[in-house]
Amino acid sequence: QKSSIEKCSVDIQQSRNKTTERPGLLNCPIYWQQLREKCLLFSHTVNPWNNSLADCSTKESSLLLIRDKDELIHTQNLIRDKAILFWIGLNFSLSEKNWKWINGSFLNSNDLEIRGDAKENSCISISQTSVYSEYCSTEIRWICQKELTPVRNKVYPDS
C-alpha cells in the first residue's frame, strides 16, 4: 500500500521516463545555477513537498537528488541564509520503512545526517547547515535540478 506522496513521486518519475528523446543540456538555462554537472533552481516561493515535486516536473527537471556529503556541502554553500529550508527529492517510504529518493533508490545512511524522525508523511529539507525531516505538508522552498550532460538522454519506450 503506497502513500499518496509515494504514488505522486512514482507517477511523475514514470512520466519523465516516457518523454521523447532530446539533446542533453549543454548549459544551464537562465536563472538556474550551475553546480558541477548539474543545474539548480532555488525557488523563491513555498509549497508542500508534493507540489514542489510537481513544479520541478513541469520544468522538465526533478527535485534535487544528492549523491554524497560533498555534493550536499556544495549545495548548502549556495543557500544565502540560515533561516531558509528547501525540499529535496527524498521522503519516507512507509511501505519500505526507509528514506527513498524520488528516482527509486534508498538513502545510504552515511550520505546525510538527518535531524528528526523517520516516519509517515516525513520529507527531507536542507538548510545552510543541516538536513531535516519535516512534515511533507509544510510549505517551504524547494530545489529543482537538471543534469548537465552533452550526451543524449536515454529513452524509455512506452509500455
Epitope: H44, D81, A83, I84, D117, S125, S133, E134, Y135, E139
Partner: antibody, heavy 119, light 107 residues
C-alpha cells in the same frame, strides 16, 4: 479558527528564569514554523526566535542567543520559550506568532503575555 | 543586519483621508516586505505580505507597493478603526527586523 494563547509571563528577578507557553489550535500545528516576537513597553516589535515545523531547526536573535531556548511539542500543539539569565531589558510583552522561516510573514498572533524583570 | 526605517514616525489625519506610509530597507530585500497594524493593547495583525499581496480578510482600502529598498503602504480612505500603529517587516534575511512604527492619529 486559528488561535494562539500565550501563558507563563509574570514578575521575575534579574538573573531568574521563566518558561513561556503558547497553545495553538485551529490549524495543523506541526506543518508551520513558529516564532516568538516581543515588544518592550511603549516600543516597537522585536523578533526573538523561530523554530521549524518539526522543531528540528531553530534560530535566534543575537539578544536571545545563549539565554533563550525555543522548543515545541507537536503532540500537545504547544510552543515554548525557556528564558534564563533574564535582564531588565527583557521586560516586554511576548507574542507567539505563526511563521518565521524565510519568506514567511507572521500571519497569526497570540494576545501576548507580559514578562517583567525587576528586583 | 538589515535596518528598516519608516516615515513618518507619526501622522494626524481625518476619516476619509488618503494616507501613505513609507518604509526603507538598508539593502535590497526584493519583495520580502510585510505590513502589520497594531491597535493599542492588542496584538499586531498582518495586512500586506510580499510587498503588495493583501492578507485574507483585510479591507481593500489597504494596499502595498514597492520592491528593492523602497516600499509604501497606502490607506485609500481612512476609517475610524484604522487609527493605530503600522509596522513594516523584512523577511529577506535573518534576523527578521521591523521598522520603528508609524502611529496614525486622529486630527
Amino acid at each position: 479558527e486559528v488561535q494562539l494563547v500565550e501563558s507563563g509571563g509574570g514578575l521575575v528577578q534579574p538573573g531568574g528564569s521563566l518558561r513561556l507557553s503558547c497553545a495553538a489550535s485551529g490549524f495543523t500545528f506541526s506543518s508551520y514554523a513558529m516564532s516568538w516576537v516581543r515588544q518592550a513597553p511603549g516600543k516597537g516589535l522585536e523578533w526573538v526566535s523561530a523554530t521549524s515545523g518539526s522543531g528540528g531547526s531553530t534560530y535566534y536573535a543575537d539578544s536571545a542567543k545563549g539565554r533563550f531556548t525555543i522548543s515545541r511539542d507537536n503532540s500537545k500543539n504547544t510552543l515554548y520559550l525557556q528564558m534564563n539569565s533574564l535582564r531588565a531589558e527583557d521586560t516586554a510583552v511576548y507574542y507567539c506568532a505563526r511563521g518565521g522561516y524565510l519568506p514567511d510573514a507572521f500571519d497569526y498572533w497570540g494576545r501576548g503575555t507580559l514578562v517583567t524583570v525587576s528586583s | 543586519d538589515i535596518q528598516m526605517t519608516q516615515s513618518p514616525s507619526s501622522l494626524s489625519a481625518s476619516v476619509g483621508d488618503r494616507v501613505t506610509i513609507t518604509c526603507w530597507a538598508s539593502q535590497s530585500i526584493s519583495s520580502y516586505l510585510n505590513w502589520y497594524q497594531q491597535e493599542p493593547g492588542k496584538a499586531p495583525k498582518l495586512l500586506i505580505y510580499a510587498a503588495s499581496s493583501l492578507q485574507s480578510g483585510v479591507p481593500s482600502r489597504f494596499s502595498g507597493s514597492g520592491s528593492g529598498t523602497d516600499f509604501t503602504l497606502t490607506i485609500s480612505s481612512l476609517q475610524p478603526e484604522d487609527f493605530a500603529t503600522y509596522y513594516c517587516q523584512q523577511t529577506y534575511s535573518t534576523p527578521l527586523t521591523f521598522g520603528q512604527g508609524t502611529k496614525v492619529e486622529i486630527k
